[in-house]
Amino acid sequence: SQVSQNCHNGSYEISVLMMGNSAFAEPLKNLEDAVNEGLEIVRGRLQNAGLNVTVNATFMYSDGLIHNSGDCRSSTCEGLDLLRKISNAQRMGCVLIGPSCTYSTFQMYLDTELSYPMISAGSFGLSCDYKETLTRLMSPARKLMYFLVNFWKTNDLPFKTYSWSTSYVYKNGTETEDCFWYLNALEASVSYFSHELGFKVVLRQDKEFQDILMDHNRKSNVIIMCGGPEFLYKLKGDRAVAEDIVIILVDLFNDQYFEDNVTAPDYMKNVLVLTLSPGNSLLNSSFSRNLSPTKRDFALAYLNGILLFGHMLKIFLENGENITTPKFAHAFRNLTFEGYDGPVTLDDWGDVDSTMVLLYTSVDTKKYKVLLTYDTHVNKTYPVDMSPTFTWKNSKLPNDITGRGPQ
């Protein structure tokens, strides 16, 4: 049902859902700090534009009595319960920030007449694609899938002269929320990734993965997995790996690779790491000082959500337009705004665009190096290192099927 919004007469409120179940195990206090830091910036920007208005956030906390797993498994109803709480209290703001779990976002979108925008730090799954009033500020699974298909098809680079059409996907069910939905998208038989590949098998047991590493009868040389180097080591250890195996390690929200003193462990030599290009600042921010790299991205997405709202509010106020309209609710897409760490671009469906970076380990220096970058906005790959010092034969990525000639 329609809920009256605290969103007029020079006073604009943001409803922030503080859910016990979250995409990342982040203390809610840190998210509050990120939101408050964002509010300070927004107030400054509006004031500089000569707009004398009030912008505040209301934090809506779940009671945590029923939905207390802490991860996303029991989040489906928590979001709806919080919306009911907002509705009963007549405390809906101009915009809803949160939830971050795919289950809860999907259910909230389905079960409510949303005449206000929803901004999510998460909601990675394909089921949250193409939602008219949902904006996602962390790379969703669709973006990963498009990169992988693009990279698989590429065959005209000095270091990749074969198109690939096969893959194993390792998915054992213990993944973090982002990895769960990324791998879920790759596994789905109706997804773009599955449609474009000729062969794809999901490995669910550690032993299956370990056996493939040296199996002469394997159907693909390429294995996709999601997590950090430690996760890979737990699984692979120091086992021997066939020389034409390529492991693609998806680790988007981890900038440990971009620390100056990092040396790649030996077990990473057959691995290409897919991560996001690191931001430029952030390190001195009060909200991010004590956060791990992943959590920094999560808190940053909350902060950028506030900045995005401020950006849209400014545009609508300057144009003398009403905020509590479907036009406002549908406007949070196909735009670039000034984020905390530089410009942030949203695509036609309100999903954040970014630069993904594919790293390899140099056999000469044992350091991570950039092989190529990929711009999700234009779905294009840009090679950076034309003569990489790979572990693979002739410093070229192998064919995805052993013994198959040039494609």
């Epitope: 971009f258 100056d260 290009s277 690191p278 970076v357 950039v370 092989l371 970058t373």
Partner: nanobody, 123 residues
Amino acid sequence: EVQLVESGGGLVQPGGSLRLSCAASGFTLDDYAIGWFRQAPGKEREGVICLTSGGLPKYADSVKGRFTISRDNSKNTLYLRMNSLRAEDTAVYYCAASGATSRWNCPPQYDHWGQGTMVTVSS
């Protein structure tokens, strides 16, 4: 002796493309952060792209999505691919190198500079 030599400049129509090269000698490009700069007539020199020694490209907003940078260590050469060129891209383009202290950040200043190559975008 450390040397950087740019080539590939010329006259191109708006919307056209060019590829500039920067050949290095006397040192290994791979160990250095490399920047492309440009100076338009009567204007200050400005940074266009930097490639950190770890290989991370960082672009000026004015060229993002149009210019790309790559490195071929076997030829000790850096490339700047410029697409969708505009009249305002007309300038002398310089490449510069810095013995990097950070693998992932652009240096505040560069030690070695090339002589530059002229790019003119005009119909």
